[in-house]
């Protein structure tokens, strides 16, 4: 079958090979499209409601005055010339619609280095087939799920026209010390080949570098974090920042189901309380910052103190939860 692509709303003429140029002709067109159930036969005589959708011209060609999505499918013509020789024509018709120029909406004017930020949402309306949206940074394609890049995509279809609206939301985590004015753009690539991509106007948000926060200090009493069974451990999270941030607590990397508090008391230590504790300070302007971890352990009778419990861990710093 010969592949034909036609733009939605435009006329389309399909030739019936081997047909005499003018009547009388012995030919018939068969259509299997979105408008038909199985095969529909059209003859040069025509007439009826189908004339507004497709009709046979005097030269035997099939004429569609305005192609629609439902006209996608197979078109076959069988013609016999004056000598009785039979010729068949076979077409596979696909339709397309190029959308308007894509746009970036809800774009950010400022991004914060080191944490995930929404850059904006790219919108393309009125395409068929759907096509794809892709993002570019300084002209180079951005690959989702690489280097702090994530993309959320949504495709909607108009209930009446059948045309597609695509949305793509870009989230990035700019590197600290990177480009202070990156250039982002988005492009629409049509679903059918041989049509060039459409690109949005670029956006250039500023990248803000947060001043590193003074470290969150985790103070443990008794010092060293080792305590006899039934003893008390008090963990205090000291944050120099003003106003005071909200402080939550983690045990073995898992948030504890407790209200925010700068102090955590383990009133009566048991084996289940042993583990690694840290606090997370959440600032309205900076995002979360995790303390170093402290290890809480039980001293069995006869054991020495501080060696049984170590204070240390991975000073995860400002980006621990980014």
């Amino acid at each position: 079958a010969q592949n034909i692509t036609a733009r939605i709303g435009e006329p389309l003429v399909l030739k019936c090979k081997g047909a005499p140029k003018k009547p009388p002709q012995r030919l018939e067109w068969k259509l299997n499209t979105g408008r038909t159930e199985a095969w529909k036969v059209l003859s040069p005589q025509g007439g009826g409601p189908w004339d507004s959708v497709a009709r046979v011209l005097p030269n035997g060609s099939l004429f569609l005055p305005a192609v629609g999505i439902q006209d996608e499918g197979i078109f076959r013509c069988q013609a016999m010339n004056r000598n009785g020789k039979e010729t068949k024509s076979n077409y596979r018709v696909r339709v397309y619609q190029i959308p308007g120029k894509p746009e970036i909406v809800d774009s950010a004017s400022e991004l914060t280095a080191g944490v995930p930020n929404k850059v904006g949402t790219c919108v393309s309306e009125g395409s068929y087939p759907a096509g794809t949206l892709s993002w570019h940074l300084d002209g180079k394609p951005l690959v989702p799920n690489e280097k702090g890049v994530s993309v959320k995509e949504q495709t909607r279809r108009h209930p009446e026209t059948g045309l597609f609206t695509l949305q793509s939301e870009l989230m990035v985590t700019p590197a600290r010390g990177g480009d202070p004015r990156p250039t982002f753009s988005c492009s629409f690539s049509p679903g059918l080949p041989r049509h060039r991509a459409l690109r949005t106007a670029p956006i250039q948000p500023r990248v803000w570098e947060p001043v590193p926060l003074e470290e969150v200090q985790l103070v443990v009493e008794p010092e060293g974090g080792a305590v006899a069974p039934g003893g008390t451990v008090t963990l205090t999270c000291e944050v120099p920042a003003q106003p005071s941030p909200q402080i939550h607590w983690m045990k073995d990397g898992v948030p504890l189901p407790l209200p925010p508090s700068p102090v955590l008391i383990l009133p009566e230590i048991g084996p289940q309380d042993q583990g690694t504790y840290s606090c997370v300070a959440t600032h309205s302007s900076h995002g979360p910052q995790e303390s170093r971890a402290v290890s809480i352990s039980i001293i069995e009778p006869g054991e020495e103190g501080p060696t049984a419990g170590s204070v240390g861990g991975s000073g995860l710093g400002t980006l621990a939860l980014a």
Partner: nanobody, 124 residues
Framework: AVQLVESGGGSVEAGGSLRLSCAAA????????LAWFRQAPGKERELVSA???????YYLPSVKGRFTISRDNAKNMVYLQMNDLKPEDTAVYIC??????????????????WGQGTQVTVSS
């Protein structure tokens, strides 16, 4: 029903002392953490001191060395002895109780039972 009733509040000059009492009814007293919170006008409620089994205690850093919490399990009473009072100690002092927990925070959200409070006013 659980009942916490505070007494002992009043007005005092800076440097003076007061002793607050909280009588608890309807709880298994010895298996509860008892605490004193305070709330000054326009400020958040803050934990001043807490007491649990034996002589285990916690104090807000700004009151450490000046305030002493104690409890009498036989009488179901908890006390807060406040010495060297300062104008910034002016607040409503409220008694709170919580069944003995695995973890304890300074947050009022952590406590289940509350008294009505007693006013402490410290003038300079």
């Amino acid at each position: 029903a659980v009942q916490l009733v505070e007494s002992g509040g009043g007005s005092v000059e800076a440097g003076g002392s007061l002793r607050l009492s909280c009588a608890a009814a309807g709880i298994a007293f010895s298996s509860y953490i008892l605490a004193w919170f305070r709330q000054a006008p326009g400020k958040e409620r803050e934990l001043v001191s807490a007491s649990w089994r034996g002589d285990s205690t916690y104090y807000l850093p700004s009151v450490k060395g000046r305030f002493t919490i104690s409890r009498d399990n036989a009488k179901n009473m908890v006390y807060l002895q406040m010495n060297d009072l300062k104008p910034e100690d002016t607040a409503v002092y409220i008694c709170a109780a919580k069944e003995f927990p695995r973890w304890l925070t300074l947050s009022p959200l952590d406590y289940d039972h509350w008294g009505q409070g007693t006013q402490v006013t410290v003038s300079s």
